[in-house]
């Protein structure tokens, strides 16, 4: 009896543990049986063809390689697809930046919020804030709120994000706090 390939599945060969950015990764397309035995393989991610070997190899995986992968095995009778297999890539915080709301120029007495934005997997588990003197600030949240903001808060700030993979730091972002008309009037 001839039949299309059966029990097609994606199997991770290496690494044996979780996948970190920069790792060498090999995925194997397995199937239990096929008749006829001569088969072809196809790999796809998000509907895009990636390769035609039984293995899909990444010399140095990147966060952009994460996603849903499927392999297809076909013979002269028909083709069978695997279930989608999710490739997760763990990486240290990257693309960090300090954003400022309502902007980077704020009048004294108002509120200013600095947010440490990043891309990380797993998510950032620890935030550290620094000022222009590289002094660590006593804030532990993703958002640093100053309310009311003072002229003395003017300066450059940067943040560091940490997860189980590693650390990343932002460039400096400058907050300018200007005097209110009332203060100028009193002077």
């Amino acid at each position: 009896v001839q039949y299309a390939p059966r029990d097609v599945r994606v199997r991770k060969i290496k690494p044996l543990s979780e996948i970190h950015s920069g790792n060498s990764v090999s995925l194997q397309c397995d199937f239990s049986s096929s008749h006829p035995k001569e088969v072809q393989f196809f790999w796809e991610k998000n509907g895009r063809l990636l390769g035609k070997e039984s293995q899909l190899n990444f010399d140095s995986i990147s966060p952009e390689d994460a996603g849903s992968y499927s392999c297809w095995v076909n013979n002269s009778i028909g083709q069978t697809a695997s279930k989608a297999w999710t490739l997760e890539v763990l990486y240290a915080p990257r693309r960090l930046r300090v954003s400022m709301s309502p902007g980077d120029q704020v009048m004294e007495g108002k509120s200013a919020t600095l947010t440490c934005e990043s891309d990380a997997n797993p998510p950032v588990s620890h935030y550290t804030w620094f000022d222009w003197n590289n002094q660590s600030l006593p804030y532990h949240s993703q958002k640093l709120r100053l309310e009311p903001v003072k002229v003395q808060h003017s300066g450059a700030y940067w943040c560091q994000g940490t997860n189980s993979v590693g650390k990343g730091r932002s460039p400096l972002s400058t907050l300018t706090v200007y005097y209110s008309p009332e203060t100028i009037g009193r002077r």
Epitope: P123, V124, S125, H126, Y127, T128, N133, Q135, S136, P138, Y139, H140, S141, Q142, K143, L144, R145, L146, E147, P148, V149, K150, H153
Partner: antibody, heavy 120, light 109 residues
Framework: QVQLQQSGAELVRPGASVTLSCKAS????????MHWVKQTPVHGLEWIGA????????AYNQKFKGKAILTADKSSSTAYMDLRSLTSEDSAVYYC?????????????WGQGTLVTVSA | QAVVTQESALTTSPGETVTLTCRSS?????????ANWVQEKPDHLFTGLIG???NRAPGVPARFSGSLIGDKAALTITGAQTEDEAIYFC?????????FGGGTKLTVL
């Protein structure tokens, strides 16, 4: 008004674990860091660590890493502290305290404390 | 780890001015230590008074003020009242964690 209601006193055996809770009310829970402080007659007040309830990000005093684990449940506006592998040294009153920002941070509001006694 | 030292006890009279200080073994206390002052009354009732060296918390009476005096942080109560009898703790930010002082027991007689 702001209130931090802590769970009741605990008598626990050495080697065991305990979870303390701190239920916040009267403000938006995710807007402020929650800190935990230990008080003993010998060492006075000691800062354990802090959690950002919005993201779950934490910071710990090196002395308490591995001893305390801080978590927060946004749906119930409750912060938790797990204390593990308890010894007599962990017998203390533990406080949660809301960290306010203003122009500078301060330990604004405090819970009433939870007494933990570790004894065989 | 830095050790933060306070006077163990002080006594004052109603209407008098009293200053409590907070010293760090790590060196001079500066604005980068964000000195905090916390009041403890009987039954574990804690209240934050001062943050960032000299920022009085909302609702805290104006007679409480924070400053730096020499190489120490200071809490001054100008015109002490009987209800100010309490234990006062300072806390200093020490690069990546807070360190509390041992507390000053203030008696207002």
């Amino acid at each position: 008004q702001v209130q931090l209601q802590q769970s009741g006193a605990e008598l626990v055996r050495p080697g065991a674990s305990v979870t303390l809770s701190c239920k916040a009310s009267g403000y938006t829970f995710t807007d402020y860091e929650m800190h935990w402080v230990k008080q003993t007659p010998v060492h006075g007040l000691e800062w354990i660590g802090a959690i950002d309830p919005e993201t779950g990000a934490t910071a710990y005093n090196q002395k308490f890493k591995g001893k305390a684990i801080l978590t927060a449940d946004k749906s119930s506006s409750t912060a938790y502290m797990d204390l593990r592998s308890l010894t007599s040294e962990d017998s203390a009153v533990y406080y949660c305290t809301r960290y306010d920002y203003g122009s500078s941070p301060w330990f604004a509001y405090w819970g009433q404390g939870t007494l933990v006694t570790v004894s065989a | 780890q830095a050790v933060v030292t306070q006077e163990s006890a002080l006594t004052t009279s109603p209407g008098e001015t009293v200053t409590l200080t907070c010293r760090s073994s790590a060196g001079a206390v500066t604005t980068s230590n964000y000195a905090n002052w916390v009041q403890e009354k009987p039954d574990h009732l804690f209240t934050g008074l001062i943050g960032g060296t000299n920022n009085r918390a909302p609702g805290v009476p104006a007679r409480f003020s924070g400053s730096l005096i020499g190489d120490k942080a200071a809490l001054t109560i100008t015109g002490a009242q009987t209800e100010d009898e309490a234990i006062y703790f300072c806390a200093l930010w020490n690069s990546n964690h807070w360190v509390f002082g041992g507390g000053t027991k203030l008696t207002v007689l």
